[in-house]
């Protein structure tokens, strides 16, 4: 038996930063669990973590070169993806994994979510604009 | 919960070898990561090395690059460190820290257990 996962088949990060919402045919709330976030099309860079259970805080882990928080809803965990470059563009793919309690569930592999990440073109105004026409 | 044993601690001369052990046991995940850490008296405990569980990722401290070896058996949810050319500096208690970021992360704060600890004095 495996956990289905539904994302947003794409996102745009505007201001170098996103929510990505990982939503599972599973309620997460009084499990062990540790929901992951994977970059790249063969799912290769594990980018960010979070471990959930029953008895402490979520645990928030972010790889280094992300910036990740995470947040948990009963059949849901978002990551929130801040100081995002351009050259992290690329498809990310939720993984959930729950060991307790038995029996251990993970999930089908989803169709990921292409993040776009837009760099910042500032126009700059000119300093000295030149004379204005009557 | 995760329990972490270590051993192969002891005395050793400059230039010797050691080789650490630290096995885990309790509920494990498809990905995390165990780490050398070790605390000489007086200081703040420092990252040693570092490896996760798909084996794919290493990190080690400048200071011991090239005479420290991290490595790690699944099968039996263990990890070693093969440390030679010992110099009196490396003497410290050694910990083995657990993780469940599921790369092989040099950040102390990372880690959600650790083991009880074992010496490694270097003298001559």
């Known amino acids: 038996n495996k956990i289905l996962v539904k994302q947003s088949p794409m996102l745009v990060a505007y201001d170098n930063a996103v929510n990505l919402s990982c939503k599972y045919s599973y309620n997460l709330f009084s499990r062990e669990f540790r929901a992951s976030l994977h970059k790249g099309l063969d799912s290769a860079v594990e980018v960010c973590v979070v471990y959930g259970n029953y008895s402490q805080q979520l645990q928030v882990y972010s790889k280094t070169g992300f910036n990740c928080d995470g947040k948990l809803g009963n059949e849901s965990v978002t990551f929130y993806l801040q100081n995002l470059y351009v050259n992290q563009t690329d498809i990310y793919f939720c993984k959930i994994e729950v060991m307790y309690p038995p029996p251990y569930l993970d999930n089908e592999k989803s169709n990921g979510t292409i993040i776009h990440v837009k760099g910042k073109h500032l126009c700059p105004s000119p300093l000295f604009p030149g004379p204005s026409k009557p | 919960e995760v329990q972490l044993v270590e051993s192969g601690g002891g005395e050793v001369q400059p230039g010797g070898s050691l080789r650490l052990s630290c096995a885990a046991s309790?509920?494990?995940?498809?990905?995390?990561?165990m780490g050398w850490f070790r605390q000489a008296p007086g200081k703040e405990r420092e990252f040693v090395a570092a490896?996760?569980?798909?084996?794919?990722?290493?990190d080690y401290a400048e200071s011991v690059k090239g005479r420290f070896t991290i490595s790690r058996d699944n099968a039996k949810n263990t990890v070693y460190l093969q440390m030679s050319s010992l110099r009196a500096e490396d003497t410290a208690v050694y910990y083995c820290?657990?993780?469940?970021?599921?790369?092989?992360?040099?950040?102390?704060?990372?880690?959600?257990?650790w083991g009880q600890g074992t010496l490694v004095t270097v003298k001559p």
């Open positions: 490896i996760n569980y798909r084996r794919d990722d290493a």
């Open positions: 820290g657990f993780t469940y970021a599921g790369w092989a992360s040099s950040r102390r704060d990372d880690y959600n257990y």
């Open positions: 309790g509920r494990m995940f498809s990905n995390y990561a």
